[in-house]
Interface confidence: low
């Protein structure tokens, strides 16, 4: 066992003692969390589509409001949106956000104020006078305007419907277009008006498909679990060759999904980065944390992949088989 864990450590796989090492070869199902595990976990905004009246809510104003709202979010998508808005507006300063609420698996709501300063002072091309931009409605001259407070909702279809907004079929189709590519599409409503769609992509890790294929060829069932909607989840799963998908799973329900498989007599390995999945890592027969993950995940896991390489999941199972064979 010591030799096995030693060899693993030399290869960037930390196995916490003999028990997980002996368990690894019994694993019949590997459940991968999507964000940060199958994907890089560094989402980026791919598209901002304005849906409302551009004169009333021009792009810059939408970006200022959305960037401020999402700045209070700890969700990776929120971080990506805020980063994008800051870059596009050429500012590090945002407005004020109050009454912030985040509903896992749905979206956020809050009140945003003090964005006038951003719109007045954020970067603009030196050779393009502000007056030109005003004509286009892309930079309202709001320096002296009465500070406005915007009521903001950002999230999935369900979240906006729950808050009384109607989503037309063409907006839903635009979202579906992105979701079919494995992207996450979120909607933005300001003051009760649907005014934008943001498409966010998180690239799949290069080795993911090979890791999945190798596990399947070893007779291991591979499952994808995610809080994302079914279309996005299915698109990512298809890219990497996973057939079984648990989508729209709330963070608190990931443990239940692991238990569900265990109740069918399966030995389950859960692979995740610890964002929303630490309890599931602890519940699994073998919890595998990828090295870039959170401290909580590394604590909860039986195996830590220091190199953040999914092929090391395969390597740990191989190593377990070889070690157990030697012991016997």
């Amino acid at each position: 066992v010591m030799v096995g864990t030693g060899v693993a450590a030399q290869n960037g796989i930390l196995i916490k003692g003999g028990k997980p090492l002996e368990m690894a070869h019994k694993i019949k199902t590997v459940m991968f969390d999507k964000t940060g595990t199958i994907t890089h976990g560094v989402p980026r905004v791919m598209r901002v589509l304005l849906l409302g009246d551009v004169a009333t809510l021009p792009l810059r104003k939408v970006l200022a409001v959305v960037g401020t709202a999402e700045a209070s979010s700890e969700h990776p998508l929120g971080v990506a949106v805020t980063k994008y808005c800051k870059e596009e507006l050429g500012t590090e300063t945002l407005g004020y956000c109050t009454d912030f609420q985040a509903v896992p698996g749905c979206g956020i709501g809050c009140k945003v104020s003090n964005v006038e300063g951003i719109l007045a002072h954020s970067e603009r091309p030196l050779s393009a006078p502000a007056s030109h931009l005003n004509e286009a409605g892309s930079l309202p001259a709001e320096k002296d305007a009465v500070p406005q407070t915007f009521s903001v909702l950002i999230g999935n279809r369900e979240w906006l419907r729950r808050n009384g907004l109607t989503i037309s079929s063409d907006v839903s189709d635009a979202m579906t277009d992105h979701e079919m590519k494995g992207q996450t599409a979120i909607l933005v409503a300001i003051d009760g008006v649907l005014c934008g769609m943001i498409a966010i992509a998180d690239a799949v890790k290069q080795e993911a498909a090979l890791a999945v294929h190798t596990l399947q060829s070893m007779g291991v069932d591979v499952v994808l679990i995610t809080g994302d909607n079914r279309k996005t989840a299915r698109a990512i799963a298809t890219q990497v060759g996973i057939n079984k998908v648990f989508a729209e799973v709330l963070p608190s329900h990931k443990v239940a999904k692991v238990q569900e498989l265990q109740n069918k007599g399966k030995k389950v390995a859960m692979v995740g980065d610890g964002v929303n999945d630490s309890p599931a890592l602890a519940q699994a027969d073998m919890g595998v944390a990828i090295g870039t993950g959170t401290d909580v995940a590394i604590e909860a896991a039986d195996v830590v992949l220091i190199r953040n390489d999914l092929l090391d999941v395969v390597a740990s199972i191989h190593l377990s088989k070889r070690t157990v064979r030697r012991i016997r």
Partner: antibody, heavy 117, light 111 residues
């Protein structure tokens, strides 16, 4: 009808400056990227830079401050300084969707810039 | 910075035949599929054929097919017509490209 049209291309002497303009119609610059691409005679397409919906601009590494992109409500200008014979090319502007990775779905017809003494 | 490398030019095809053009990206393109294909005829502007690696642009005949993911992409033209004689370019993202987001181009000669 949505379109882009380049103008301002002409013969310039080496070391000179020139501004070519991309005029758009039928859509709002506040929702799209505009990219500038050039094509030397018999050569491939070469990206120069991009102007974002908010007016932010990004350039290819060889530009080194010689070229500047700016925009108004309906035009995007490419100002070129310190021109050399190697800058002789047809200059195209093209539209990309609301992000930095959208495809270029609409192109202007191009304007020819000739740098020669 | 992303670099797109295309099949060396030119490629010959007979009318009614099939031609395949390859485009290799280093590193992989955004979201593994953020790649488009263009057709350009002499003296004309480029025309979008395929986006998202495999989605046919509006008005483009279904003879044109895009495939691939990550780093390897292919444009296949089946039932080649005389009108398909052109140079074909692949392209990736543009905002912070630093290097050229366009491939070097592949000339298709129809015999």
């Amino acid at each position: 009808c949505q379109s882009l049209e380049e103008s301002g291309g002409r013969l310039v002497t080496p070391g000179g400056s020139l501004t070519v303009t991309c005029t758009v119609s039928g859509f709002s610059l506040s929702s799209y990227w505009i990219i500038w691409v050039r094509q030397a005679p018999g050569e491939g397409l070469e990206w120069i830079g991009s102007s974002g919906p908010s007016g932010s601009a990004y350039y290819t590494s060889w530009v080194k401050g010689r070229f500047t992109i700016s925009k108004t409500s309906t035009t995007v200008d490419l100002k070129m300084t310190g021109l050399t014979t190697e800058d002789t090319a047809t200059y195209f502007c093209a539209r990309a969707g609301g992000s930095d990775y959208d495809w270029f779905d609409l192109w202007g017809q191009g304007t020819l810039v000739t740098v020669s003494s | 910075a992303q670099v797109l490398t295309q099949t060396p030019s030119p490629v010959s095809a007979a009318v009614g035949g099939t031609v395949t053009i390859n485009c290799q990206s280093s590193p992989s393109v955004a979201n593994n599929n953020w790649l488009s294909w263009f057709q350009q005829k002499p003296g004309q502007r480029p025309k979008l054929l395929i986006y998202g690696a495999s989605t046919l642009a509006s008005g483009v005949p279904s003879r044109f097919k895009g495939s691939g993911s990550g780093t390897q992409f292919t444009l296949t033209i089946s039932d080649v017509q005389c009108d398909d004689a052109a140079t074909y370019y692949c392209a990736g993202g543009h905002k912070t490209a630093e290097k050229n987001p366009f491939g070097g181009g592949t000339e298709v000669v129809v015999k």
